[in-house]
Amino acid sequence: GVFNYEVETPSVIPAARLFKSYVLDGDKLIPKVAPQAITSVENVEGNGGPGTIKNITFGEGSRYKYVKERVDEVDNTNFTYSYTVIEGDVLGDKLEKVCHELKIVAAPGGGSILKISSKFHAKGDHEINAEEMKGAKEMAEKLLRAVETYLLAHSAEYN
């Protein structure tokens, strides 16, 4: 079956700047600002566009070792990014793959909102509960906060 999970996280950073840093340059920036969480992001195939396969190595603060992700769609105008987790110990025994769609929208009072819509594709008739899906939410929030911290202190970057 397929299990859906949605997350919304606010940020003080405007949408365009957050998309540019967190999504478009995230492979480079995130390991620098959250080394305990992510040690490295390497392109195994492709150059970042749809079809690119990325190998992400988790840091010492994570209970997982690595994931492989496939980039499905990047929309620089609407600030959306879709990717699929296709391999790695995060999938465990129950999951076949996880599809994530990120969208960054402007918040009414300034700043932005990171919206993540995830589809957890279970193997066979395995059930996936909210607790098991929460890890992806927590990781996304932690990485967003790490990027946000850096951006607040370096106002000239990613404008």
Partner: antibody
């Protein structure tokens, strides 16, 4: 055990050049920013800038841009702070620190290097 | 650049007192604020990161609170070894001017 060991005290004349160092050990040196912090005699802490040893990405606080050069040699896990022409007002203790706490807190510090510039 | 304003610049207190130091940012820094302790002739030591998280090995009498622009460091019961100068800092950026905690 994480350690940052700085080079020894220096006494210099105005106009001279200087390079002080900060050697990191006990962790993956390439993966954490190193900051340099100035403390003038009897004064508070001043953030100078940071370097990411993995690719030598460097960020300076505007007031220190062009006044000093921050560099790193990851092969010997060492960061540097360099002056091409010292001034009397550069007299201070200089600390290096690792930004290893969540969201960029400086969790490990060197012992400090006292730089005295006097004619 | 965001400015960090710390107050008071100095205070006198006795062992056992509850001490509060405040730090104000010129614009919101969410909760990306660190607190350090520095003793004479020594390097600073990280006490609190992300406004309220206690750094490993730091006694629980130290606590931090606040978000946005206003932050507080509290020492619940001052000990002899706590007489020092305390600094707030926006992550990756400027420090406050410091608060010297002296014995009454």
């Amino acid at each position: 055990e994480v350690q940052l060991v700085q080079s020894g005290a220096e006494v210099k004349k105005p106009g001279e050049s200087l390079n002080i160092s900060c050697n990191g050990s006990g962790y993956n040196f390439t993966k954490y920013w190193i900051a340099w912090v100035r403390q003038m005699p009897g004064k508070g802490l001043e953030w100078m800038g940071i370097i990411y040893p993995g690719d030598s990405d460097t960020k300076y606080r505007p007031s220190f841009q062009g006044q000093v050069t921050i560099s790193a040699d990851k092969s010997i896990t060492t960061a540097y702070l360099q002056w091409s022409r010292l001034k009397v007002s550069d007299t201070a203790i200089y600390y290096c620190a690792r930004l290893g706490a969540t969201y960029g807190g400086a969790d490990y510090w060197g012992q400090g290097t006292l730089v005295t510039v006097s004619s | 650049d965001i400015q960090m304003t710390q107050s008071p610049s100095s205070l006198s207190a006795s062992v056992g007192d509850r001490v509060t130091i405040t730090c104000q940012a010129s614009q919101s820094i969410v909760n990306y604020l660190n607190w350090y302790q520095q003793k004479p002739g020594k390097a600073p030591k990280l006490l609190i990161y992300a406004a309220s998280s206690l750094q490993s090995g730091v006694p629980s009498r130290f606590s931090g609170s606040g978000s946005g622009t206003d932050f507080t460091l509290t020492i619940s019961s001052l000990q002899p070894e706590d007489f020092a100068t305390y600094y707030c800092q926006q992550s990756y950026a400027a420090f406050g001017e410091g608060t010297k905690v002296e014995i009454t």
